[in-house]
């Protein structure tokens, strides 16, 4: 069960936060190294684990993935893990840790040597089954070297949303992946009512932009559950 | 920066309940997971419980599970803890903790922000 690990001694005995605890073998699960204590520093650490609950990976942190920490564990719920590194297996990018991408089940290195002139790799994405494989699927995208060195523009080609330049995040667009827009305010957005619910769209929108949320819009809120409008409004 | 105000706390008896709730504001938008931790005199703060607030999945301690309820209101920009079956053990300050983890705000780790802490005596 969840609980259980959480528990375990690998999780207790991780090393600190800012150690290099992702990847790490055994590190079921990272610990967060924010810290805010009252009347003290705000990036201080603590030792004991802080579990992360997450609908996505955008969620997690940089070093990051979402996904349910055991097979079989407590149905529905999904936590930030540490990345992946080389060598370690994976079933989408979002597992490798930075400078990784996932082919063919394992996280490689996406370094300049290995990305010189343009490669061919297969990008498919999961549609609600978290341990769906990435390379299940027969489309295949042209990646350029290019997007890892420089922040990709619209609609270039992306792993996560750090590859994008400012005011833009890395979405699904069909079976790949590409930089949209961040969402302004007035624009209809999703918001993830349940687990796996984003892996289903093939046309994925971005988060809201900054000072923005994702709510139900005012004159929707007699709706159906399942008709109601979520749009990008100002607090 | 975000700010949180925990309430709901005070003197219970053992086997009563307390509601706790936990308003943020500020840079609301940056939180996508809401949790409480609790820290006993003289021990180390404890994770208690966390919500993602987009998923709805909730994630608890052993020591509180099928004991304690952590929820969320949206709307209110509010996370509340309900607490039953309140146990002298669980007599601790009480903080409600902001998580902020988003990639897309440059952190590499999923990390919490905290508030002051409301404290909760369980005693007869």
């Known amino acids: 069960t969840l609980n259980s690990v959480l528990n375990s001694n690998a999780i207790k005995n991780l090393p600190p936060p800012l150690g290099g605890a992702a990847g790490h073998p055994g590190s079921a699960v990272s610990a967060a190294p924010g810290i805010l204590y009252p009347g003290g520093n705000k990036y201080q650490t603590i030792d004991n684990y802080q579990p992360y609950p997450c609908a996505e990976d955008e969620e997690c942190g940089t070093d990051e993935y979402c996904a349910s920490p055991t097979r079989g564990g407590d149905a529905g719920v999904q936590i930030c893990l540490a990345c992946r590194k080389r060598r370690k297996r994976c079933m989408r990018h979002a597992m490798c840790c930075p400078g990784n991408y996932c082919k063919n089940g394992i996280c490689v290195s996406s370094d300049q040597n290995h990305f010189r002139g343009e490669i061919e790799e297969t990008i498919t994405e999961s549609f609600g089954n978290d341990h769906s494989t990435l390379d299940g699927y027969s489309r295949r995208t042209t990646l350029s070297s290019k997007m890892y060195h420089t922040k990709g523009q619209e609609g270039s080609v992306c792993l996560r949303s750090s590859d994008c330049a400012s005011g833009l995040c890395c979405a699904r667009h069909f079976w790949s992946k590409i930089c949209k827009p961040v969402l302004k305010e007035g624009q209809v957005c999703t918001k993830h009512r349940r687990k796996g619910s984003h892996g289903l769209e093939i046309f994925q929108r971005c988060y809201c932009g900054e000072g923005l949320s994702c709510r139900i819009q005012k004159d929707h809120h007699q709706a159906s559950n399942s008709s109601r409008l979520h749009t990008c409004q100002r607090h | 920066e975000v700010q949180l105000v925990e309430s709901g706390g005070g003197l219970v008896q053992p086997g009563g309940s307390l509601r706790l709730s936990c308003a943020a504001s500020g840079g609301i938008y940056r939180v996508n997971t809401m949790g409480w931790f609790r820290q006993a005199p003289g021990k180390e703060r404890e994770f208690v419980a966390a919500i993602n607030w987009s998923g709805g999945s909730t994630v608890y301690a052993d020591s509180v599970k099928g004991r304690f309820t952590i929820s969320a209101d949206n709307s209110k920009n509010t996370a509340y803890l309900q607490m039953n079956s309140l146990k002298p053990e669980d007599t601790a300050v009480y903080y409600c903790?902001?998580?902020?983890?988003?990639?897309?705000?440059?952190?590499?780790?999923?990390?919490?922000?905290w508030g002051q802490g409301t404290l909760v005596t369980v005693s007869s």
């Open positions: 903790a902001a998580g902020n983890g988003g990639r897309q705000y440059g952190h590499s780790r999923a990390r919490y922000d």
